[in-house]
């Protein structure tokens, strides 16, 4: 009964109910069933230790080494703030693709890098909370092996552009404050557009699995296609946005746009281009420096701001950018003031004009003469791309273009009164801006990119991947800690602890068959011996 | 606030090597390249070579190619130029200078005070 | 490699006057490659302007600089006591290289 009910948990007691019938019809004699029972209870006992001990061998074996953690930290100065992120994975699996996950992000509080030029002795202060946060949620113990990396994205790219020797004092003081802390820290730099492009690209495929080569017997990522095809990844900034696919046929027109990898054992041919100047926040400055050179007075009716909206804007805030320069001219005033009429199609046009399509040396271009091969493939679109989407309510993969830019004119033909209302938590600032920040996003998508109504199902708006912010740091960090190998790193084909399982499962089968063969095929004389 | 302060004066004799120090303080010394220019007594500046001292790379004026060589101790953000095979027209005042971050121009915004290095037999 | 020329070799001018210094390049440079350096007697050099017309942090706007292509200017709006020194330029495109200098000295 115990052997019984021992082997039907393990699935097997059909089996052994069969076994055990032939020798229950041997019954010749009492003396013969007796001594076949207690062969039987004999192997039986024999055959439970045998599993037990496999059992005990090898789940002791198999029993969880203490994981080796390690945390690495990226801070991403942008343009507009700086937020911080701390990733974490085990030790012993590095190379291993999918194992780097976030555990925190810290928003730091205040406008970006950039903006502390005038008064570069608080940013030490500016990034305590956040540090001190990072001190709390790394162990103490990891504390001085944890690298620290920042990296400074466009509104220090225009810095450095107006004065270098200012972008280079920012990066002094934060690099000052940033190695009081017992982290590791690896220095604070200014990364280009092409980095930015190539490490947002990397950190959406690895969080995707695009680089493993494995197969998986299930997915547990979303956006679910040809796991081989990398998606492309669409990132805007507040200064500037990044395009990153592999383009259907390796193109050598513009090798300025070129980047070769090899990752994981396969080679990639990466399309990539920055757009200074084409975040959202410089873009709206764009537009309103180049709207106002043709207004008549100090007042801008601006179709990208809902109706009854109002705001008075500096003139030399408008002309502080090197983005606007471009549009800069001697006005009769020194501010004046946006006041809004809510027309998303007047909007459009106007966003349009930023975009000079009328020259391309190349046989296609983005704009601006930029070269953009053909689209290939399913897109990631993050960073302020899924914000603004997110927040309009469009993220969704069943919402059309059409249905979108129907969505557009009618949000931004709500008077500004009624938006307050509506959304009364946000700050208005922000939810000024929403209107031609979602307008913007659909020229720069549609007009500036060339997506159609029908590719635009290709496009999928992603804040977080497996509980990862989508966006350049992860890459960058995998790039730096030297976490994404050029080889598929040698591994067995089943980790080691499957290994173990499987074979304590062979070797209680293997048993209990020749229990099985014993009894069958193979019985004593000593069983038929006096049956004469 | 920055500084660099480099090693004192020597007086070699032609065909020996000079080490010439330079010590970085006031920021975070792998940030930034580090220059060496020399001055000959009355004359011009000249431009050696530089050393990024975030991996160790170096980058030396074709005119000293093989008889110059930069170093650097991150241990103690110092950087080291050695020129070998001396002669009486390597006396000059060497000056370390620091350059770029990544990605910047190269001007030279801060100098060390010098260093006479003087060749005589 | 680039060679600079700078003119004149000497500049005898009084306190108050303008200083016009020039910096001709024997090839085209990129106005972002381009600087001049103000030396002391005995002193190590200081950069004025950086991208052929951006003042260095902390230098007085007297200092101005100027041109593109290959013909460099640096000005000094009017002469204190203290600009009278030694004036170098300087490019950068693969190795830097200096030009011969301008000495600005009391008339």
């Known amino acids: 009964m115990l052997f019984d009910s021992i082997l039907s948990t393990v699935g097997l007691s059909k089996l052994v109910s069969v076994v055990s019938s032939p020798a229950a019809a041997l019954s010749k004699s009492n003396v013969k069933t007796f001594c076949s029972k207690n062969i039987l209870a004999i192997l039986g006992f024999s055959s439970i230790i045998a599993v037990i001990a496999l059992l005990a061998v090898g789940l002791t074996q198999n029993k969880a080494l203490p994981e080796n953690i390690k945390y690495g930290i990226v801070l991403d100065a942008g343009s507009s703030h700086t937020s911080l992120y701390i990733y974490k994975w085990p030790a012993e699996k590095e190379n291993d693709t999918g194992v780097v996950h976030q555990v925190e992000e810290c928003r730091v509080k205040g406008p970006g890098i950039s903006k502390y030029v005038q008064k570069v002795n608080e940013i030490g202060i500016y990034l305590t909370d956040c540090m001190e946060r990072a001190r709390e949620v790394i162990p103490r113990s990891q504390h001085q092996e944890t690298p620290v990396y920042l990296g400074a994205t466009a509104g220090m790219r225009l810095l450095r552009m107006e004065s270098e020797e200012l972008a280079d004092r920012v990066l002094d003081v934060v690099e000052r404050s940033l190695s009081n802390y017992p982290f590791d820290f690896q220095g604070a730099r200014i990364i280009t557009g092409q980095e930015e492009g190539a490490y947002g690209w990397i950190t959406i495929n690895y969080l995707l699995g695009k680089f493993s080569q494995k197969t998986r017997w299930f997915s547990i990522v979303p956006y679910e296609t040809n796991n081989q095809e990398t998606f492309g990844a669409l990132d805007l900034g507040g200064a500037s946005t990044q395009i990153t696919f592999v383009p259907q046929n390796q193109t050598t027109e513009s090798p300025d746009n070129a980047l070769q990898f090899r990752l994981y054992g396969k080679d990639y041919n990466v399309y990539t281009h920055s757009f200074l100047c084409y975040g959202k926040d410089q873009a709206l400055w764009q537009k309103l420096a180049k709207d106002i050179q043709v207004a008549s007075n100090e007042i801008l009716r601006d179709p990208c701001f809902h109706p009854g909206y109002k705001k008075v804007v500096n003139v030399s805030d408008l002309y502080k950018t090197p983005c606007t320069k471009r549009f800069e001219m001697t006005l009769p005033f020194q501010q004046f003031e946006i006041q809004g009429i809510g027309n998303y199609q007047q909007c459009h046009q106007s966003v349009l004009e930023l975009f000079n399509t009328s020259y391309c040396p190349y046989s296609q271009c983005a704009f601006n003469g930029i070269f953009l091969p053909p689209l290939q493939g399913d897109f990631g679109a993050f960073s302020a791309f899924y914000f603004v989407m997110n927040f309009l309510n469009l993220t969704s993969e069943k919402v059309s273009q059409e249905k979108v830019t129907e969505m557009m004119k009618k949000f931004c033909s709500q008077p500004w009164e009624e938006i307050k209302t509506s959304y009364a938590g946000v700050k208005e600032k922000y939810l000024s801006e929403y209107c031609f920040s979602g307008t913007y996003i659909l020229s720069l998508l549609l007009q500036g990119y060339h997506f159609t109504a029908d590719s635009w199902e290709h496009i999928h708006f992603i804040g977080k991947i497996q509980g990862s912010d989508a966006g350049w740091t992860l890459g960058y960090m995998l790039n730096l800690t030297n976490m994404i190998p050029a080889e598929q790193p040698l591994s067995t084909p089943l980790s080691h602890s499957t290994y173990v399982f499987l074979m304590v499962l062979f070797s209680l089968v293997l048993v209990i068959v020749a229990i099985i063969g014993l009894l069958i095929f193979h019985k004593p004389s000593y069983f038929w011996k006096d049956m004469v | 606030q920055v500084q660099l302060v480099q090693s004192g004066a020597e007086v070699k004799k032609p065909g020996a090597s000079v080490k010439v120090s330079c010590k970085a303080s006031?920021?975070?010394?792998?940030?930034?390249?580090m220059h060496w220019v020399r001055q000959a007594p009355g004359q011009g500046l000249e431009w050696m070579g530089r050393i990024n001292p975030s991996v160790g790379s170096t980058w030396y004026a074709q005119k000293f190619q093989g008889r110059v060589t930069m170093t650097r101790d991150t241990s103690t953000s110092t950087v080291y130029m050695e020129l070998s095979s001396l002669r009486s027209e390597d006396t000059a005042v060497y000056y370390c200078?620091?350059?770029?971050?990544?990605?910047?121009?190269?001007?030279?915004?801060?100098w060390g005070q010098g260093t006479l290095v003087t060749v005589s037999s | 490699e680039i060679v600079l020329t700078q003119s004149p070799g000497t500049l005898s001018l009084s306190p108050g006057e303008r200083a016009t210094l020039s910096c001709r390049a024997s090839q085209s440079v990129s106005s972002s490659y381009l600087a001049w350096y103000q030396q002391k007697p005995g002193q190590a050099p200081r950069l004025l302007i950086y991208y052929a017309s951006s003042r260095a942090y902390g230098i007085p706007d007297r200092f101005s600089g100027s041109g593109s292509g290959t013909d460099f200017t640096l000005t000094i709006s009017r002469l204190e006591p203290e600009d009278f020194a030694v004036y170098y330029c300087q490019q950068y495109h693969n190795a830097i290289t200096f030009g011969g200098g301008t000495k600005v000295e009391i008339k």
């Open positions: 200078a620091r350059g770029k971050r990544e990605g910047g121009t190269e001007y030279l915004r801060v």
């Open positions: 006031g920021y975070i010394f792998k940030s930034y390249e």
